[in-house]
């Protein structure tokens, strides 16, 4: 009878993560008596995957009944494959021996490659908000994919971006890989509703790429423009002054009225109007009792937006034509009926 040969017919096997890998192995003879073992890798550091004789291998099942003497099919199935299972698997025939079984013949090996899907891309923007015309960086990360080949694209509102740098790690062979990309985006005043999208395409995704998004509303700060105007006189000695705060984002805004440098009233933007581009407008007004002033009044609308240094706009109110009324020392009427926004 010819000497036993161990046949592993598949040079390589490709399996998707989470699926079951079948590693085929047959022997050409029933002689000698002894167990089959499966190893990953060769040499002294090889890892035992299955031993016909003894041990517990919960992920491994045999294709045929290996308990029987007449069996020559030593194929195994390994369940719930992960990228960590990648490697070359050897089917090795031992012969019964003492004190230990003796390695008799090995198969040529089967390389198991694992296809693993990339994780959902995570896009993160800068830690602090930036204003229009500034360039900000966005990063995109995805992990755990195999094989290494992968394509990453950046989009802003559907338009592909070109200013980005991408790295796939590690550079050498690995069970799985990660991708990291940084894109530069120039902000415009219209970007409150804009989105930055990172798109990852991989062989495991069957043409349906994964996307991660970041809303520029989390990144942009549009500073307000201020306009202070004097309205027609409502009563004989009252002047209505309005401060229009336009095109700001985000909404967080505090407005302070000053009369000749003294704080008259402070209020927080609450009921605002939203523009089509996502920015906000707000208006505050002040009733000034001109009879309370002997001299001209400098009215200042001071706005602190989103924790930034205050910006202000002033308006000079001429009061020379109005003699001061006796007993009045209140420059601005701050009654509840007056403390309302006009829009």
């Amino acid at each position: 009878e010819e000497e036993l040969q161990v046949i592993q017919p598949d040079k390589s096997v490709l399996v998707a993560a989470g699926e079951t890998a079948t590693l085929r192995c047959t022997a050409t003879s029933l002689i000698p008596v002894g167990p089959i073992q499966w190893f990953r890798g060769a040499g002294p550091g090889r890892e035992l995957i299955y031993n016909q004789k003894e041990g517990h291998f919960p992920r491994v099942t045999t294709v045929s009944d290996l308990t029987k003497r007449n069996n020559m099919d030593f194929s195994i199935r390994i369940g719930n494959i992960t990228p960590a299972d990648a490697g070359t698997y050897y089917c090795v025939k031992f012969r019964k021996g003492s004190p230990d079984d003796v390695e008799f013949k090995s198969g040529a090996g089967t390389e198991l490659s694992v296809r693993a899907k990339p994780s959902a891309p995570v896009v993160s923007g800068p830690a602090a908000r930036a204003t229009p015309q500034h360039t900000v960086s966005f990063t995109c990360e995805s992990h755990g994919f195999s094989p290494r080949d992968i394509t990453l694209k950046w989009f802003k509102n559907g338009n592909e971006l070109s200013d980005f740098q991408t790295n796939v790690d590690p550079v050498g062979e690995s069970v799985s890989y990660s991708i990291h990309s940084t894109a530069k985006v120039v902000l415009t005043r219209e970007d409150v509703h804009s989105q930055v999208i990172c798109e990852v395409a991989h062989v495991t995704l069957q043409g349906d790429p994964l996307r991660g998004t970041a809303n520029l509303s989390e990144t942009i700060r549009v500073p307000p423009t201020l306009e202070v105007t004097q309205q027609p006189v409502r009563a004989e000695n009252q002047v209505n002054v309005t401060c229009q705060v336009r095109k700001f984002y985000p909404q967080r805004l505090q407005l302070t009225w000053l009369e000749n440098g003294n704080v008259s009233r402070t209020e927080t933007a609450s009921t605002v109007t939203e523009n089509k581009d996502g920015t906000y407008n707000w208006m505050s007004w002040l009733l000034v009792n001109v009879s309370a002033h002997r001299d001209d009044v400098k009215l200042t609308c001071q706005v602190e937006h989103d924790g930034q240094p205050a910006v202000s706009k002033s308006h000079d109110l001429k009061v020379s034509a109005h003699p001061k009324e006796q007993g009045s020392n209140t420059a601005a009427e701050n009654t509840g009926s007056n403390e309302r926004n006009i829009y």
Partner: antibody, heavy 118, light 107 residues
Framework: EVQLVESGGGLVQPGGSLRLSCAAS????????MHWVRQATGKGLEWVSV???????YYTGSVKGRFTISRKNAKNSLYLQMNSLRAGDTAIYYC????????????WGQGTMVTVSS | DIQMTQSPSSLSASVGDRVTITCRAS??????LAWFQQKPGKAPKSLIY???SLQSGVPSKFGGSGSGTDFTLTISSLQPEDFATYYC?????????FGQGTKLEIK
């Protein structure tokens, strides 16, 4: 059904010969090592001989040179030719299949009685 | 030849008991150890191979363990049909050898 049936036992005088047969059915006979095991009345089991798939043979020391194991795969049959029989060879003779991957016995015949007596 | 020594030679137990029979080899047998059950007038029946693997069709109340030279057969809950003689056997190297047997009797 997997089955082993021994035959050929009987009474024989010391120094005589006897040929035991074991008829196998229900499995591919040629793919298994086959063994003979004996048991003297009221005693324990004693392994006697084996013939491998390739025809290789082994014997226990007390029967070497006197007993010959053989097989005819075409007839699904195992044989034990016993010569120069002694009183100490008196026993029930069982054939057994090395049915497990490691040649562990999994199937036994019902046995045939060999009595060596004058 | 490898000597196989079983203990005890005989054992009395009751239905429902858990019993243990031990077998010692005179040298390492690389776990190539089998256990057999034999009832009077019958052929032996295979129970365990490679020290701990259960033969097909054998109930799981039979369990084998051990390695090196010391091995154990455990029957977890004795039933009337379990009273018989039990043999261990090494089949690591020729000549294969059996233990002298343990007779399990009803108390």
């Amino acid at each position: 059904e997997v089955q082993l049936v021994e035959s050929g036992g009987g009474l024989v005088q010391p120094g005589g010969s006897l040929r035991l047969s074991c008829a196998a059915s229900g499995f591919t006979f040629s793919s298994y090592d086959m063994h003979w095991v004996r048991q003297a009345t009221g005693k324990g089991l004693e392994w006697v001989s084996v013939i491998g798939i390739a025809g290789d043979t082994y014997y226990t020391g007390s029967v070497k040179g006197r007993f010959t194991i053989s097989r005819k795969n075409a007839k699904n049959s195992l044989y034990l030719q016993m010569n120069s029989l002694r009183a100490g060879d008196t026993a029930i003779y069982y054939c057994s299949r090395g049915g497990n991957w490691d040649d562990a016995f999994d199937i036994w015949g019902q046995g045939t009685m060999v009595t060596v007596s004058s | 030849d490898i000597q196989m020594t079983q203990s005890p030679s005989s054992l009395s137990a009751s239905v429902g008991d858990r019993v243990t029979i031990t077998c010692r080899a005179s040298q390492g047998i690389n776990n190539y150890l089998a256990w057999f059950q034999q009832k009077p007038g019958k052929a032996p029946k295979s129970l365990i191979y490679t020290a701990s693997s259960l033969q097909s069709g054998v109930p799981s109340k039979f369990g084998g363990s051990g390695s090196g030279t010391d091995f154990t057969l455990t029957i977890s809950s004795l039933q009337p049909e379990d009273f018989a003689t039990y043999y261990c056997q090494q089949y690591n190297s020729y000549p294969y050898t059996f233990g002298q047997g343990t007779k399990l009797e009803i108390k």
